[in-house]
């Protein structure tokens, strides 16, 4: 990733201004490292692209909840 050169952590410097359709999201990870300027969520889309989002926004929290439920539900 462009901001992970020489370090194992990716930081977010800007957040998306857009609500992403949850159907486009595959997974997420939280960015809490002290090396980064702000806490963030990085969503990975179904085509493996990454997007920085603000964990304080409701749509981000709802999307994380949705993805959590998806991973908890066994696929038949």
């Amino acid at each position: 990733q462009p901001d992970a050169i020489n370090a194992p952590v990716t930081c977010c410097y800007n957040f998306t201004n857009r609500k992403i359709s949850v159907q486009r999201l595959a997974s997420y990870r939280r960015i809490t490292s002290s090396k980064c300027p702000k806490e963030a969520v990085i969503f990975k889309t179904i085509v493996a692209k990454e997007i920085c989002a603000d964990p304080k926004q409701k749509w981000v929290q709802d999307s994380m909840d949705h993805l959590d439920k998806q991973t908890q539900t066994p696929k038949t």
Epitope: Q1, P2, C12, N14, R18, S21, R24, E50, I51, C52
Partner: antibody
């Protein structure tokens, strides 16, 4: 097949109007922002406008603000550009494009229509 | 609006050459920069997004780098199908803007 098929270009007189259409197929159109980009003959690319998934949020470049209107019909998987008060300098190939989010910003284009030529001339 | 200046505006190169194109932003755009290839009469094709991420299906001879004001697109070994015009584009802020392009021609 994932594609954007454009229609609606042509010759129009200065001051006239034209409506461009872009039909999407092969992907869930309602999940994506969409944009219009134009290219004057022999020139570079100019982003014109984009529209949110449900059509509630729109952005325009200053050069077309108040004259052009972007809209969409998700039931028809279609994007539109209504162009009014056309000028000679609006002569260009107009492209529709699927508009994505990046890691640190919003608005790059991973899927394009083939373009449609709009000529504004008397 | 953020202005993007590409250099050179055109260049001549041979098959197998290493080619470096540059794009300079008038303001900081973080890593929110994309590169496109366009051939005559065709729509642009996305090559690179987020300054350095290779779009799916794009050959690995294309690479992007940079952040802040200066960005580069490198073609490690120019192929016959690479002769085209290349545009950079910033998506850090509205209005979204493109560079003026660099035309890569056959020497």
């Amino acid at each position: 097949e994932v594609q954007l098929v454009q229609s609606g270009g042509g010759l129009v007189q200065p001051g006239g109007s034209l409506r461009l259409s872009c039909a999407a197929s092969g992907f869930t159109f309602s999940h994506y922002w969409m944009s219009w980009v134009r290219q004057a003959p022999g020139k570079g690319l100019e982003w014109l406008a984009n529209i949110e998934q449900d059509g509630s949020e729109k952005y325009y470049v200053d050069s077309v603000k108040g004259r052009f209107t972007i809209s969409r019909d998700n039931a028809k998987n279609s994007l539109y550009l209504q162009m009014n008060s056309l000028r000679a300098e609006d002569t260009a190939v107009y492209f529709c494009a699927r508009d994505l989010e990046g890691l640190h910003g919003d608005g790059y284009f991973d899927l394009w229509g083939r373009g449609t030529l709009v000529t504004v001339s008397s | 609006a953020i202005q993007l200046t590409q250099s050179p505006s055109s260049l001549s190169a041979s098959v197998g050459d290493r080619v470096i194109l540059t794009c300079r932003a008038s303001q900081g755009v973080s890593s929110a920069l994309a590169w496109y290839q366009q051939k005559p009469g065709k729509a642009p094709k996305l090559l690179i997004y987020d300054a350095s991420s290779l779009e799916s299906g794009v050959p690995s001879r294309f690479s992007g780098s940079g952040s802040g004001p200066d960005f580069t697109l490198t073609i490690s070994s120019l192929q016959p199908e690479d002769f085209a015009t290349y545009f950079c584009q910033q998506f850090n802020s509205y209005p979204l803007t493109f560079g003026g392009g660099t035309k890569v021609e056959i020497k």
